[in-house]
């Protein structure tokens, strides 16, 4: 089985300020085990937007079916976009264990906020 | 319905062989890592065995070498090849599913009883 | 072998109370840790995955927490229902251990 990749189809996305944002991300294999995680930014003070294993993300929903194993599509939904959500956004896919260690992270989408459309 | 059947249980002489069956319905098998599991009489739990969606397979030190674990996509069953069974094997075995993400337990069968005894 | 270790190994109470179960594990798991009722001559049933997720259709009552390697399960408002063993069991490696179980029963 070829190694897992994390794929962003997505360079930039654009969104105007109190709209929804899709960030979109899918993997290509099962293998391995373990949570996929978003996060804004890139290096340690990056900052965590969605945890598939526990957290609570109010602004966050996914896109897809994530109770079947077969699911491989990771895409978000952010709501309410504000100009402070822009950046970079990445898909970052976890290997289970005790840490959890990051596996493989897609090449980011960085987000753009256009003005509330008067 | 998510559903997983046992079957193939029985009584057995010590050296004998055995072949446990697990029929799978409401989902696809081969895109979650499964699980065996056995409960002696009046005892607790103990993981058997499981095998990977990329077929890896793995097993507790007891039964290495004498139990084979497998899957057979096209019936969607999950097996557990006995051989050189001894008295402590002796156990209700349930099969069982792995979760979506972290392979955290799920969905358990019936059971099925094995008896090994002269 | 990473070994689970619950305590008590049983416990009475009575309708109405609140209870909790310990289990302690032998190093470092992470949250990869659950929680199984099991009644007399039947299979497990799933409650708890990592540590503190409930399983779709299990009953708030039931509440699990801890990381690393102390946990504890959690039920509010015991129901006669409720009396029954339950297992801890750690799935951050293989091979996947249980706990041995804390009988719970109706006092």
């Known amino acids: 089985e070829e190694e897992l990749q994390v794929i962003q189809p997505d360079k930039s996305v654009s969104v105007a300020a109190g709209e929804s944002a899709i960030l979109h991300c899918t993997v290509t294999s099962l293998i391995p085990v373990g949570p996929i995680q978003w996060f804004r930014g890139a290096g340690p003070a990056r900052e965590l937007i969605y945890n598939q294993k526990e957290g609570h993300f109010p602004r966050v929903t996914t896109v897809s079916e994530s109770t079947k194993r077969e699911n491989m599509d990771f895409s978000i939904s952010i709501s309410n976009i504000t100009p402070a959500d822009a950046g970079t956004y990445y898909c970052v896919k976890f290997r289970k264990g005790s840490p959890d260690t990051e596996f493989k992270s897609g090449a980011g989408t960085e987000l753009s906020v256009r003005a509330k459309p008067s | 319905e998510v559903q997983l059947v046992e079957s193939g249980g029985g009584l057995v002489q010590p050296g004998g062989s055995l072949r446990l069956s697990c029929a799978a319905s409401g989902f696809t098998l081969s895109s979650y890592d499964m699980h065996w599991v056995r409960q002696a009489t009046g005892k607790g739990l103990e993981w058997v065995s499981a095998?990977?969606?990329?077929?890896?397979?793995y097993y507790t030190g007891s039964v290495k070498g004498r139990f084979t674990i497998s899957r057979e996509n096209a019936k969607n069953s999950l097996y557990l090849q006995m051989n050189s069974l001894r008295a402590g094997d002796t156990a209700v075995y349930y099969c069982?599913?792995?979760?979506?993400?972290?392979?955290?337990?799920?969905?358990w069968g019936q059971g099925t009883m094995v008896t090994v005894s002269s | 072998d990473i070994q689970m270790t619950q305590s008590p190994s049983s416990l009475s109470a009575s309708v109405g109370d609140r209870v909790t179960i310990t289990c302690r594990a032998s190093?470092?798991?992470?949250?990869?840790l659950a929680w199984f009722q099991q009644k007399p001559g039947k299979a497990p049933k799933s409650l708890i995955y990592t540590a503190s997720s409930l399983h779709s259709g299990v009953p708030s009552k039931f509440s699990g927490s801890g990381s690393g390697t102390d946990f504890t399960l959690t039920i509010s408002s015991l129901q006669p229902e409720d009396f029954a063993t339950y297992y801890c069991q750690q799935y951050v490696s293989y091979p996947y251990t249980f706990g041995q179980g804390t009988k719970l029963e109706i006092k």
């Open positions: 069982v599913r792995g979760g979506v993400w972290d392979d955290a337990f799920d969905i």
């Open positions: 190093q470092d798991i992470n949250n990869y």
């Open positions: 095998i990977g969606t990329a077929g890896d397979t």
